[in-house]
């Protein structure tokens, strides 16, 4: 796949999942009324991030906003922090790598800053998506633990336990939020390593260290210099090479194994 | 002005069907819940069945279940409340409502009588 | 199911009196999604069709008389009449909209000594 292709494709797929993480993060179904016991229902209970609501039988559907912030789950907040991390890195990510598209011309941007920025945005990403993903697997972990506990309480005739305010005879188990949570993070993930894959071959030509040493006349040691490597941004590095071939090698083509030259 | 009109009752012999209609007018009946309710001579209200909006999801009282089936054709505004296996326990005036917010009955009609006996 | 018990079942009052009915449903009507209570109130006068007085235990549907008022939450509600008046003489029923089957109370019978 070519650079282009690949930067292309990790920014589309980081797009659909960032519009997904802000998706999931505005839906109201994070949990849904457990319907086993009673699938019947003419009330349906569902509660997301921001607000919990009612759909009746009657057509009508009414919600309520968590008016409060004292008063909420601690479980609660840092899984809304942890969304509303994600949908920032992901804008940040997104505005970054508009900038870093190798489709794109910018003034006299050259690939190097190119490349970059598309680590930058690749890793935004990563991490925005890593946000989502913990995000809903906190409130989903949430979700079992009250489901159990409220379950434990209706045979021993407790009431429900919940994070949320529940009625005695109400559950929650997972809504369609979680899903879309759940999918737009890993793609939100994936395009990030995308971008970041796509950031390797972004770099460019004279300094990806395909460094070549000459064989030098009276002595068979060539010294690369120090400050060439420096100049890339990557630190410097004067390490020796050994040549018993003769002629021009790259770095990229020295075996790691040994070699019928290494025992002479 | 809210409209629900029944219509169909009439004395039947246990065992016999019937089947109840229920003409609204004055509202846009596709976007309600309807159902029908039911008063044995001399007694209380009992709830009978139910139709959502959509006419994707029926409910039933336990002593109906498998012998009264409600419908809806929105396309005429007519309720329908069809009564198989009667049983002389299903005498009642049988009324027809709209639910609204709340899931109450905010408009009820005037009702029929159904009589099941021999 | 939901069991809706009312109390008393008949109750005779002077005119002007204020006068309370109860409801006790045997599971809580308060729903966890909008802290709404689903239970309503309805009026049937001899020879008519129940007329819808509250909804949410509290909400006064419209054209239904300030002197009346409903409250209550979970399993405890109450219908309030605080002036009785000639034309509210009828069967006053409390139902379950909670959970299907909708149920309603045995009524309560008004009646003016």
């Known amino acids: 796949m070519s650079v282009t292709a690949c930067q292309g494709l990790g920014f589309v797929v980081s797009l659909i999942g960032f519009a997904g993480i802000i998706a999931a993060t505005c839906m109201d179904q994070w949990s849904t009324q457990d319907l086993y016991n009673n699938p019947v229902t003419a009330v349906f209970n569902y509660q997301g991030l921001w607000r919990s609501c009612v759909r009746e039988s009657s057509g009508f559907t009414e919600c309520r906003g968590y008016f409060t912030l004292l008063g909420l789950p601690a479980m609660l907040q840092a899984v809304r922090a942890l969304m509303i991390v994600g949908i920032v890195l992901g804008v940040i990510g997104i505005l970054v790598s508009i900038f870093a598209l190798k489709c794109i011309r910018i003034g006299s941007m050259d690939d190097s800053a190119k490349a970059k920025m598309t680590l930058t945005s690749g890793i935004l990403f990563i991490i925005s998506g890593i946000c989502a993903i913990i995000g809903v697997s906190v409130f989903a972990n949430m979700l079992v633990t009250n489901f159990w506990m409220s379950t434990a309480n209706m045979y021993s005739g407790m009431g429900g336990m919940g994070g949320m305010v529940q009625t005695v005879q109400t559950r929650y188990t997972f809504g369609a939020a979680l899903f879309v949570g759940w999918v737009a993070g890993g793609l939100t993930l994936i395009g990030g390593v995308m971008m970041c894959i796509a950031c390797r071959g972004l770099t460019p030509d004279d300094s990806n260290f395909k460094a070549v040493s000459y064989h030098a006349s009276g002595q068979n040691v060539a010294y690369r210099p120090g400050g060439f490597k420096a100049s890339t941004g990557f630190g410097s590095n004067t390490r020796n090479k050994k040549i018993y071939d003769g002629g021009a090698r790259t770095e990229d083509d020295e075996q790691s194994h040994p070699t019928k030259y290494d025992y002479v | 002005e809210v409209q629900l009109l029944e219509s169909g009752g009439g004395l039947v012999q246990p065992g016999g069907s019937l089947r109840l209609s229920c003409a609204a007018s004055?509202?846009?009946?596709?976007?309600?819940?309807m159902s029908w309710v039911r008063q044995a001579p001399g007694k209380g209200l009992e709830w009978v069945a139910t139709i959502i909006i959509g006419g994707s999801y029926t409910y039933y009282a336990d002593s109906v279940k498998g012998r009264f089936t409600i419908s809806r054709d929105n396309s005429k505004n007519t309720l329908y409340l069809q009564m198989n296996s009667l049983r002389a326990e299903d005498t009642a005036v049988y009324y027809c409502?709209?639910?609204?917010?709340?899931?109450?009955?905010?408009?009820w009609g005037q009702g029929t009588l159904v009589t099941v006996s021999s | 199911d939901i069991v809706m018990t009312q109390s008393p079942d008949s109750l005779a009052v002077s005119l002007g009196e204020r006068v309370t009915m109860n409801c006790k449903s045997s599971?809580?009507?308060?729903?966890?999604?909008?802290?709404?209570?689903?239970l309503s109130w309805y009026q049937q006068k001899p020879g008519q069709p129940p007329k819808l007085l509250f909804y949410?235990?509290?909400t006064r549907e419209s054209g239904v008389p300030d002197r009346f008022s409903g409250s209550g939450s979970g399993t405890d509600f109450t219908l309030t009449i605080s002036s009785v008046q000639a034309e509210d003489v009828a069967v006053y029923y409390c139902?379950?909209?909670?959970?299907?089957?909708?149920?309603f109370g045995q009524g309560t019978k008004l009646e003016i000594k």
């Open positions: 409502t709209r639910l609204v917010k709340g899931n109450a009955m905010d408009y």
């Open positions: 139902q379950n909209d909670y959970s299907y089957p909708f149920t």
């Open positions: 004055g509202f846009t009946f596709s976007s309600y819940t």
């Open positions: 599971q809580s009507l308060l729903s966890s999604g909008n802290q709404k209570n689903y």
């Open positions: 949410w235990a509290s």
